[in-house]
Protein backbone atom coordinates (compact mmCIF):
# COMPACT_ATOMS: atom_id res chain seq x y z
CA UNK A 1 0.00 0.00 0.00
CA UNK A 2 1.00 3.61 -0.73
CA UNK A 3 2.57 5.26 2.21
CA UNK A 4 0.07 8.05 4.05
CA UNK A 5 1.14 11.52 3.23
CA UNK A 6 -1.12 12.65 6.13
CA UNK A 7 -2.14 11.31 9.20
CA UNK A 8 -5.75 11.22 11.39
CA UNK A 9 -6.40 13.59 14.63
CA UNK A 10 -3.94 12.63 17.30
CA UNK A 11 -1.60 11.11 15.06
CA UNK A 12 1.84 12.00 13.52
CA UNK A 13 3.70 11.14 10.21
CA UNK A 14 6.98 9.69 10.72
CA UNK A 15 9.43 7.20 8.92
CA UNK A 16 6.39 7.39 6.41
CA UNK A 17 3.66 6.00 8.68
CA UNK A 18 1.30 6.97 11.21
CA UNK A 19 2.46 6.89 14.82
CA UNK A 20 -0.52 7.91 17.76
CA UNK A 21 0.76 10.86 19.44
CA UNK A 22 0.80 10.61 23.10
CA UNK A 23 -1.60 12.38 26.00
CA UNK A 24 -1.36 15.13 27.61
CA UNK A 25 1.01 14.46 30.82
CA UNK A 26 2.66 12.12 28.48
CA UNK A 27 5.86 12.54 26.58
CA UNK A 28 7.83 10.46 23.62
CA UNK A 29 10.38 7.88 24.08
CA UNK A 30 10.03 6.44 21.52
CA UNK A 31 8.30 6.28 17.50
CA UNK A 32 5.92 3.75 16.44
CA UNK A 33 7.04 1.35 14.54
CA UNK A 34 5.55 -0.86 11.73
CA UNK A 35 5.31 -3.53 15.03
CA UNK A 36 5.28 -1.31 17.64
CA UNK A 37 3.10 1.27 19.43
CA UNK A 38 4.16 4.44 20.21
CA UNK A 39 5.99 4.74 23.64
CA UNK A 40 4.83 7.15 26.22
CA UNK A 41 5.90 8.07 29.98
CA UNK A 42 4.46 10.01 32.03
CA UNK A 43 5.34 13.93 32.99
CA UNK A 44 7.47 13.88 36.35
CA UNK A 45 6.25 15.65 39.48
CA UNK A 46 6.18 19.46 39.04
CA UNK A 47 6.24 18.98 34.53
CA UNK A 48 3.49 19.16 32.42
CA UNK A 49 2.72 18.71 29.02
CA UNK A 50 -0.69 20.33 27.88
CA UNK A 51 -1.53 18.72 24.73
CA UNK A 52 -1.79 15.59 22.65
CA UNK A 53 2.02 15.68 21.41
CA UNK A 54 5.47 14.13 20.38
CA UNK A 55 7.67 16.08 23.12
CA UNK A 56 10.51 14.32 24.09
CA UNK A 57 11.01 16.34 27.67
CA UNK A 58 8.12 17.94 29.55
CA UNK A 59 7.50 21.62 30.52
CA UNK A 60 8.74 22.82 34.21
CA UNK A 61 5.77 24.27 36.02
CA UNK A 62 6.34 27.88 36.37
CA UNK A 63 7.07 29.36 40.46
CA UNK A 64 4.75 31.60 41.49
CA UNK A 65 7.92 33.17 43.74
CA UNK A 66 6.56 35.34 46.78
CA UNK A 67 9.47 37.28 46.65
CA UNK A 68 8.33 38.92 43.24
CA UNK A 69 4.94 39.04 45.16
CA UNK A 70 3.40 35.81 43.22
CA UNK A 71 0.93 33.55 44.71
CA UNK A 72 -0.54 30.26 42.85
CA UNK A 73 -3.99 30.50 41.69
CA UNK A 74 -4.06 27.14 40.15
CA UNK A 75 -1.67 24.47 41.40
CA UNK A 76 0.16 22.68 38.43
CA UNK A 77 -0.52 19.09 37.34
CA UNK A 78 0.85 16.43 35.00
CA UNK A 79 -1.56 18.53 32.24
CA UNK A 80 -1.28 22.10 32.89
CA UNK A 81 1.34 24.78 34.16
CA UNK A 82 0.54 26.49 37.33
CA UNK A 83 -0.66 29.84 37.09
CA UNK A 84 0.32 32.59 38.58
CA UNK A 85 -1.08 35.79 40.70
CA UNK A 86 -0.50 38.52 42.80
CA UNK A 87 -1.03 39.02 46.14
CA UNK A 88 -3.11 41.19 47.54
CA UNK A 89 -2.37 44.77 46.61
CA UNK A 90 -0.29 44.18 43.62
CA UNK A 91 -1.24 43.44 39.98
CA UNK A 92 0.60 41.36 37.13
CA UNK A 93 3.52 43.27 35.23
CA UNK A 94 2.58 41.08 32.43
CA UNK A 95 0.11 38.54 31.00
CA UNK A 96 2.40 35.58 31.68
CA UNK A 97 2.31 37.25 35.47
CA UNK A 98 6.12 37.00 35.89
CA UNK A 99 6.15 39.85 38.56
CA UNK A 100 3.86 42.19 40.35
CA UNK A 101 3.81 45.64 40.66
CA UNK A 102 2.17 47.54 43.28
CA UNK A 103 -1.44 48.92 42.53
CA UNK A 104 -1.51 52.28 41.32
CA UNK A 105 -3.29 55.12 43.84
CA UNK A 106 -5.60 58.05 42.12
CA UNK A 107 -3.91 61.54 43.33
CA UNK A 108 -6.15 63.51 44.83
CA UNK A 109 -8.36 65.32 41.89
CA UNK A 110 -8.90 61.90 40.78
CA UNK A 111 -11.25 59.19 41.75
CA UNK A 112 -11.18 55.13 41.59
CA UNK A 113 -13.10 54.46 38.12
CA UNK A 114 -11.98 50.62 38.25
CA UNK A 115 -10.45 48.73 41.64
CA UNK A 116 -7.30 46.78 40.37
CA UNK A 117 -7.50 43.54 40.54
CA UNK A 118 -4.56 40.58 40.65
CA UNK A 119 -4.33 41.07 37.18
CA UNK A 120 -4.97 44.85 35.91
CA UNK A 121 -4.31 48.11 37.23
CA UNK A 122 -5.91 51.21 39.30
CA UNK A 123 -8.02 52.97 36.54
CA UNK A 124 -8.37 56.79 37.49
CA UNK A 125 -10.85 59.16 36.35
CA UNK A 126 -10.33 63.40 36.99
CA UNK A 127 -12.91 64.37 39.37
CA UNK A 128 -15.77 65.88 37.43
CA UNK A 129 -17.50 69.51 37.93
CA UNK A 130 -19.75 68.54 41.34
CA UNK A 131 -17.36 66.14 42.69
CA UNK A 132 -14.28 65.98 44.35
CA UNK A 133 -11.22 63.93 46.22
CA UNK A 134 -8.58 64.83 48.64
CA UNK A 135 -7.05 61.81 49.26
CA UNK A 136 -4.57 59.67 47.49
CA UNK A 137 -6.13 56.23 46.89
CA UNK A 138 -6.94 52.82 45.20
CA UNK A 139 -10.20 52.61 46.11
CA UNK A 140 -11.79 55.50 46.73
CA UNK A 141 -14.17 57.11 44.11
CA UNK A 142 -14.88 60.89 43.48
CA UNK A 143 -17.29 61.98 46.05
CA UNK A 144 -20.42 64.59 45.24
CA UNK A 145 -19.98 68.02 47.12
CA UNK A 146 -22.09 68.45 50.12
CA UNK A 147 -25.22 69.66 49.25
CA UNK A 148 -25.60 72.82 51.33
CA UNK A 149 -29.47 73.58 50.33
CA UNK A 150 -30.52 70.29 51.51
CA UNK A 151 -28.96 71.34 54.77
CA UNK A 152 -30.43 75.20 55.10
CA UNK A 153 -26.79 76.44 54.30
CA UNK A 154 -25.25 78.02 52.19
CA UNK A 155 -21.84 77.72 49.69
CA UNK A 156 -19.42 80.05 51.88
CA UNK A 157 -16.80 78.19 49.62
CA UNK A 158 -17.06 76.95 46.34
CA UNK A 159 -15.64 73.12 45.72
CA UNK A 160 -12.41 72.01 43.65
CA UNK A 161 -11.81 68.61 42.37
CA UNK A 162 -9.52 68.48 45.18
CA UNK A 163 -12.04 69.64 48.12
CA UNK A 164 -15.45 70.17 48.86
CA UNK A 165 -17.72 72.93 49.38
CA UNK A 166 -17.81 74.77 52.42
CA UNK A 167 -21.53 75.34 53.71
CA UNK A 168 -22.34 78.18 56.36
CA UNK A 169 -25.22 79.98 57.99
CA UNK A 170 -27.76 81.63 55.75
CA UNK A 171 -27.32 85.95 56.46
CA UNK A 172 -30.20 87.12 58.32
CA UNK A 173 -32.10 89.76 57.08
CA UNK A 174 -31.93 92.03 60.19
CA UNK A 175 -34.85 93.60 60.84
CA UNK B 1 7.15 -0.70 50.42
CA UNK B 2 6.82 2.56 50.36
CA UNK B 3 8.18 4.38 54.34
CA UNK B 4 8.13 7.26 55.65
CA UNK B 5 9.68 8.11 58.58
CA UNK B 6 9.61 10.99 60.73
CA UNK B 7 12.24 12.33 63.55
CA UNK B 8 13.82 14.91 65.90
CA UNK B 9 10.55 15.89 67.90
CA UNK B 10 10.66 16.73 71.26
CA UNK B 11 10.29 19.09 73.87
CA UNK B 12 11.45 22.80 72.66
CA UNK B 13 11.33 26.30 74.95
CA UNK B 14 9.15 29.60 73.10
CA UNK B 15 11.72 31.15 70.41
CA UNK B 16 13.94 27.69 70.26
CA UNK B 17 14.70 25.90 67.28
CA UNK B 18 14.22 22.42 66.29
CA UNK B 19 15.15 19.95 62.90
CA UNK B 20 12.43 18.02 61.77
CA UNK B 21 14.14 14.75 59.26
CA UNK B 22 11.84 12.37 57.18
CA UNK B 23 14.00 9.57 55.81
CA UNK B 24 12.20 7.67 52.65
CA UNK B 25 12.43 4.42 51.22
CA UNK B 26 10.88 1.97 49.34
CA UNK B 27 10.64 4.19 46.47
CA UNK B 28 13.04 6.78 44.46
CA UNK B 29 12.49 9.89 46.58
CA UNK B 30 13.75 12.50 43.92
CA UNK B 31 10.32 11.56 41.64
CA UNK B 32 8.35 12.73 44.81
CA UNK B 33 7.29 16.10 46.02
CA UNK B 34 7.05 16.23 49.15
CA UNK B 35 5.11 18.18 51.86
CA UNK B 36 4.99 18.58 55.67
CA UNK B 37 1.50 18.60 57.48
CA UNK B 38 0.78 19.35 61.06
CA UNK B 39 -2.02 18.46 63.29
CA UNK B 40 -1.92 20.00 66.93
CA UNK B 41 -3.05 17.65 69.76
CA UNK B 42 -6.84 16.57 69.01
CA UNK B 43 -7.38 19.34 66.08
CA UNK B 44 -7.69 18.87 62.34
CA UNK B 45 -4.94 18.70 59.73
CA UNK B 46 -2.88 21.78 58.36
CA UNK B 47 -0.46 22.12 55.49
CA UNK B 48 2.95 23.38 56.41
CA UNK B 49 5.65 23.39 53.63
CA UNK B 50 5.96 21.61 49.91
CA UNK B 51 8.98 21.27 48.43
CA UNK B 52 9.37 19.47 44.10
CA UNK B 53 10.86 16.82 43.31
CA UNK B 54 14.45 18.92 41.90
CA UNK B 55 14.13 21.29 44.94
CA UNK B 56 13.24 24.46 42.51
CA UNK B 57 9.67 25.13 43.85
CA UNK B 58 9.02 25.46 47.36
CA UNK B 59 5.59 26.98 49.24
CA UNK B 60 4.78 27.43 52.87
CA UNK B 61 1.86 28.56 54.76
CA UNK B 62 1.64 31.86 55.89
CA UNK B 63 1.61 30.73 59.73
CA UNK B 64 5.23 29.31 59.24
CA UNK B 65 6.58 31.89 56.65
CA UNK B 66 9.87 32.84 57.75
CA UNK B 67 10.48 30.96 60.50
CA UNK B 68 10.72 27.62 58.70
CA UNK B 69 12.25 26.08 56.59
CA UNK B 70 11.99 22.95 54.15
CA UNK B 71 14.77 21.28 52.18
CA UNK B 72 15.60 17.89 50.92
CA UNK B 73 18.88 15.80 50.17
CA UNK B 74 17.78 13.42 47.54
CA UNK B 75 21.45 11.91 47.76
CA UNK B 76 19.91 10.78 50.94
CA UNK B 77 16.59 9.87 50.44
CA UNK B 78 15.98 12.68 53.21
CA UNK B 79 13.14 15.61 54.27
CA UNK B 80 13.96 18.51 56.64
CA UNK B 81 12.15 21.25 58.15
CA UNK B 82 14.03 23.39 60.04
CA UNK B 83 11.75 25.28 62.31
CA UNK B 84 13.12 28.65 64.10
CA UNK B 85 11.27 31.43 66.89
CA UNK B 86 9.06 28.60 67.59
CA UNK B 87 5.61 29.45 69.54
CA UNK B 88 3.19 27.16 71.73
CA UNK B 89 0.72 27.56 68.40
CA UNK B 90 3.50 25.16 66.76
CA UNK B 91 2.82 22.06 69.23
CA UNK B 92 1.52 19.65 66.68
CA UNK B 93 2.33 16.20 65.23
CA UNK B 94 4.55 16.78 62.33
CA UNK B 95 3.82 14.27 59.38
CA UNK B 96 5.89 14.32 56.83
CA UNK B 97 3.77 13.24 53.01
CA UNK B 98 4.92 12.81 49.95
CA UNK B 99 3.06 13.80 46.10
CA UNK B 100 3.56 12.10 43.12
CA UNK B 101 3.12 13.69 39.30
CA UNK B 102 0.15 11.91 38.52
CA UNK B 103 -2.79 12.12 40.70
CA UNK B 104 -1.07 15.62 42.41
CA UNK B 105 -2.32 14.50 45.90
CA UNK B 106 -0.62 13.47 49.08
CA UNK B 107 -0.76 9.77 48.70
CA UNK B 108 1.78 8.81 51.64
CA UNK B 109 2.11 9.60 54.62
CA UNK B 110 4.55 9.43 58.20
CA UNK B 111 3.33 8.02 61.21
CA UNK B 112 4.56 11.77 62.60
CA UNK B 113 6.67 13.24 65.27
CA UNK B 114 5.37 15.21 68.09
CA UNK B 115 6.98 19.14 68.26
CA UNK B 116 5.89 20.08 71.70
CA UNK B 117 6.50 23.68 72.62
CA UNK B 118 6.53 24.63 76.03
CA UNK B 119 8.20 26.82 79.31
CA UNK C 1 -6.96 31.32 51.04
CA UNK C 2 -9.74 28.64 50.19
CA UNK C 3 -12.01 27.80 53.11
CA UNK C 4 -13.37 23.90 53.32
CA UNK C 5 -16.58 23.77 55.64
CA UNK C 6 -17.35 19.66 56.43
CA UNK C 7 -20.71 19.14 57.83
CA UNK C 8 -21.69 17.34 59.99
CA UNK C 9 -18.68 17.24 62.39
CA UNK C 10 -19.44 14.07 63.49
CA UNK C 11 -21.78 11.17 63.13
CA UNK C 12 -22.99 8.36 64.98
CA UNK C 13 -23.27 5.21 62.71
CA UNK C 14 -24.07 1.32 62.70
CA UNK C 15 -22.25 -1.05 60.76
CA UNK C 16 -23.65 -1.93 57.29
CA UNK C 17 -25.93 1.89 57.02
CA UNK C 18 -24.91 4.13 54.60
CA UNK C 19 -22.99 7.65 55.58
CA UNK C 20 -22.84 10.64 53.39
CA UNK C 21 -20.66 13.34 54.29
CA UNK C 22 -20.83 16.87 52.81
CA UNK C 23 -17.71 19.23 51.64
CA UNK C 24 -17.78 23.12 50.46
CA UNK C 25 -15.11 25.18 49.56
CA UNK C 26 -14.94 28.79 49.27
CA UNK C 27 -14.38 29.07 45.86
CA UNK C 28 -14.18 26.30 42.90
CA UNK C 29 -11.48 23.52 42.36
CA UNK C 30 -12.45 22.87 38.77
CA UNK C 31 -9.09 23.09 37.00
CA UNK C 32 -9.77 24.77 33.66
CA UNK C 33 -6.86 23.06 31.62
CA UNK C 34 -8.59 19.37 32.50
CA UNK C 35 -11.24 19.86 33.47
CA UNK C 36 -10.89 17.84 37.08
CA UNK C 37 -12.26 19.21 40.07
CA UNK C 38 -9.08 18.74 42.80
CA UNK C 39 -10.97 17.73 45.73
CA UNK C 40 -9.42 14.83 47.88
CA UNK C 41 -10.45 12.50 50.90
CA UNK C 42 -7.96 11.36 53.59
CA UNK C 43 -9.06 9.05 56.11
CA UNK C 44 -7.68 9.21 59.66
CA UNK C 45 -8.06 6.57 62.27
CA UNK C 46 -7.14 6.63 65.72
CA UNK C 47 -3.97 6.98 66.75
CA UNK C 48 -2.69 6.85 62.82
CA UNK C 49 -1.78 9.42 60.04
CA UNK C 50 -4.20 10.32 57.13
CA UNK C 51 -4.45 7.99 54.28
CA UNK C 52 -5.79 8.64 51.03
CA UNK C 53 -8.85 7.75 49.91
CA UNK C 54 -10.09 9.87 46.96
CA UNK C 55 -8.50 12.08 44.65
CA UNK C 56 -10.04 14.04 41.89
CA UNK C 57 -13.35 14.49 43.81
CA UNK C 58 -14.29 10.34 42.66
CA UNK C 59 -11.07 8.32 41.84
CA UNK C 60 -10.83 6.04 44.41
CA UNK C 61 -7.14 5.54 44.99
CA UNK C 62 -5.90 1.85 44.84
CA UNK C 63 -7.30 -0.71 47.50
CA UNK C 64 -9.97 1.51 48.85
CA UNK C 65 -13.39 -0.89 49.18
CA UNK C 66 -15.83 0.20 46.29
CA UNK C 67 -18.13 1.55 48.95
CA UNK C 68 -16.88 4.71 49.06
CA UNK C 69 -17.58 6.67 46.74
CA UNK C 70 -16.99 10.96 46.18
CA UNK C 71 -19.05 12.88 44.16
CA UNK C 72 -19.71 16.90 43.66
CA UNK C 73 -17.88 19.47 41.62
CA UNK C 74 -16.93 22.98 41.80
CA UNK C 75 -17.56 23.79 45.25
CA UNK C 76 -20.01 21.21 46.49
CA UNK C 77 -18.51 17.61 47.46
CA UNK C 78 -19.98 14.85 49.29
CA UNK C 79 -18.32 11.08 50.33
CA UNK C 80 -20.53 8.51 50.41
CA UNK C 81 -20.13 5.24 52.61
CA UNK C 82 -22.33 2.26 51.80
CA UNK C 83 -22.72 -1.18 54.16
CA UNK C 84 -20.47 1.05 56.83
CA UNK C 85 -17.88 -1.44 58.27
CA UNK C 86 -16.17 -1.46 61.85
CA UNK C 87 -12.91 -0.53 60.71
CA UNK C 88 -14.32 2.89 58.90
CA UNK C 89 -14.67 4.44 62.11
CA UNK C 90 -12.42 7.22 61.68
CA UNK C 91 -12.19 10.80 60.91
CA UNK C 92 -12.88 11.79 57.43
CA UNK C 93 -11.13 15.34 56.21
CA UNK C 94 -11.90 17.03 52.45
CA UNK C 95 -9.12 18.66 51.15
CA UNK C 96 -8.45 21.46 48.38
CA UNK C 97 -5.74 20.23 46.44
CA UNK C 98 -6.30 22.58 44.02
CA UNK C 99 -4.20 25.37 44.90
CA UNK C 100 -1.54 26.70 47.19
CA UNK C 101 -2.14 27.14 50.54
CA UNK C 102 -3.55 23.75 50.44
CA UNK C 103 -6.38 23.73 52.83
CA UNK C 104 -8.46 21.01 54.59
CA UNK C 105 -11.95 20.89 56.01
CA UNK C 106 -12.31 20.84 59.91
CA UNK C 107 -13.24 16.81 59.29
CA UNK C 108 -15.92 14.33 59.87
CA UNK C 109 -15.57 11.88 62.35
CA UNK C 110 -17.75 8.83 63.02
CA UNK C 111 -18.15 7.39 65.65
CA UNK C 112 -20.42 3.61 67.08
CA UNK C 113 -23.94 4.22 68.06
Known amino acids: PEPPTACREKQYLINSQCCSLCQPGQKLVSDCTEFTETECLPCGESEFLDTWNRETHCHQHKYCDPNLGLRVQQKGTSETDTICTCEEGWHCTSEACESCVLHRSCSPGFGVKQIATGVSDTICEPCPVGFFSNVSSAFEKCHPWTSCETKDLVVQQAGTNKTDVVCGPQDRLRA | EVQLVESGGGLVKPGGSRRLSCAASGFTFSDYGMHWVRQAPGKGLEWVAYISSGNRIIYYADTVKGRFTISRDNAKNSLYLQMNSLRAEDTAVYYC????????????WGQGTLVTVSS | DIVMTQSPSSLTVTAGEKVTMSCKSS????????????LTWHQQKPGQPPKLLIYWTSTRESGVPDRFTGSGSGTDFTLTISNLQAEDLAVYYCQNDYTYPLTFGAGTKLELK
Open chain 3, 27 to 38: QSLLNSGNQKNY
Open chain 2, 97 to 108: ARQDGYRYAMDY
